[in-house]
Interface confidence: medium
């Protein structure tokens, strides 16, 4: 089946700087401010648009090694990122495959509200664990607060 | 299961104050963002407010902006709508609805509502 | 602020029909639409959420699709509990918007 779970949150960053430094540089970014969360990024094949592969390694202690990331659509003009998770991590007996859509939408305070979209293609009947989701949901909110964190303290970066 | 209860509707008289209440049960409350929708007698729904599960951000819809304000108490399980200046066209059903999952922005589950008259 | 058109505002159809509704948003809003249905007297109630996703519990007779700014929600054979009136909203981006709602009547 397919299990749908969507969630916002804001961010005091533009939407344009953001897509930038959040989506576009991420895999340089993450590491470099979030090494808790994040050990590295390797780019596997593509050069960042559709059909890219990233592998993406966490560090010592977490309960999946890496995961595999593809990316399906890349869209500049609505600040749009759609990837799936195809390898690694939770995926396996159980789960096919996490499609995922980020959307930055502008506010009119100067900053921008993040949609996330997050499809679970599970094999068979079973169903997606909350604490999965959870898990997943905190991850994205760490990095987001450390670019955030970042953009603020490096006013001349991502313009 | 999901249940929710609104309660302190009445009838007003323009340009008073009015606060709504609902009561939330059969969830963690504090996990989810909640919303406030009216309803004119015979009239279609019109999106009022929401406020985040934290109580971190609230919107407004444009014509109850600067006059309505939403707030929570998770404390106590309860959403509140504060309605200031209020005018004939606020006469609607107030309902409180919860969000599906966490903070997916739209109204999931609905209480059955509240009713507001406002009149001279 | 997305405007919301909704049509038609009102049908007649009989059991066993296929219905469609549409909405239409002013600008881009992904599959960020959800539909409800009204009973007299009654909350609304979700139907669908992110265009085309199912909420627990609804009967597959409905679905929805779309995405962008054009929505269709179809019920494909009508009962009896589903003459009652059927509300779009967008939540891409505040303030949310509802369409005008569509009443489906007994022909």
């Known amino acids: 089946g397919v299990f749908n779970y969507e969630t916002e949150t804001t961010s005091v960053i533009p939407a344009a700087r953001l897509f930038k430094a959040f989506i576009l540089d991420g895999d340089n970014l993450f590491p470099k401010v979030a090494p808790q969360a994040i050990s590295s990024v390797e780019n596997i094949e593509g050069n960042g648009g559709p059909g890219t592969i990233k592998k993406i390694s966490f560090p010592e202690g977490f309960p999946f090694k890496y995961v595999k990331d593809r990316v399906d659509e890349v869209d500049h003009t609505n600040f749009k990122y759609n990837y799936s998770v195809i390898e690694g991590g939770p995926i396996g007996d159980t789960l096919e495959k996490i499609s995922n859509e980020i959307k930055i939408v502008a506010t009119p305070d100067g900053g921008s509200i993040l949609k996330i979209s997050n499809k679970y293609h599970t094999k068979g009947d079973h169903e997606v664990k909350a604490e999965q989701v959870k898990a997943s949901k905190e991850m994205g909110e760490t990095l987001l607060r450390a670019v955030e964190s970042y953009l603020l303290a490096h006013s001349d970066a991502y313009n | 299961q999901v249940q929710l209860v609104e309660s302190g509707g009445g009838v007003v008289q323009p340009g008073r104050s009015l606060t709504v209440s609902c009561a939330a049960s059969?969830?963690?409350?504090?996990?989810?963002?909640m919303h406030w929708v009216r309803q004119a007698p015979g009239k279609g729904l019109e999106w009022v407010a929401i406020?985040?599960?934290?109580?971190?951000?609230?919107f407004y819809a444009d014509s109850v902006k600067g006059r309505f304000a939403i707030s929570r108490d998770n404390s106590k399980n309860t959403l509140y709508l504060q309605l200031n200046s209020l005018r004939a066209e606020d006469t609607a059903l107030y309902y409180c609805a919860r969000d599906n999952f966490h903070t997916s922005g739209y109204p999931w589950s609905w209480g059955q509502g509240v009713l507001v008259t406002v009149s001279s | 602020d997305i405007q919301v058109t909704q049509s038609p505002s009102s049908l007649s159809a009989s059991v066993g029909d296929r219905v469609t509704i549409t909405c239409r948003a002013s600008?881009?809003?992904?599959?960020?639409l959800a539909w409800f249905r009204q009973k007299p007297g009654k909350a609304p109630r979700s139907l669908i959420y992110a265009a085309s996703s199912l909420q627990s519990g609804v009967p597959s007779r409905f679905s929805g699709s779309g995405s962008g700014t054009n929505f269709t929600l179809t019920i494909r054979s009508l009962l009896p509990e589903d003459f009652a009136t059927y509300y779009c909203l967008q939540y891409n981006s505040y303030p949310r918007t509802f369409g005008r709602g569509t009443k489906v009547e007994v022909k």
């Open positions: 059969g969830f963690t409350f504090s996990d989810y963002n």
């Open positions: 600008q881009d809003i992904s599959s960020y």
């Open positions: 406020i985040w599960y934290d109580g971190s951000n609230e």
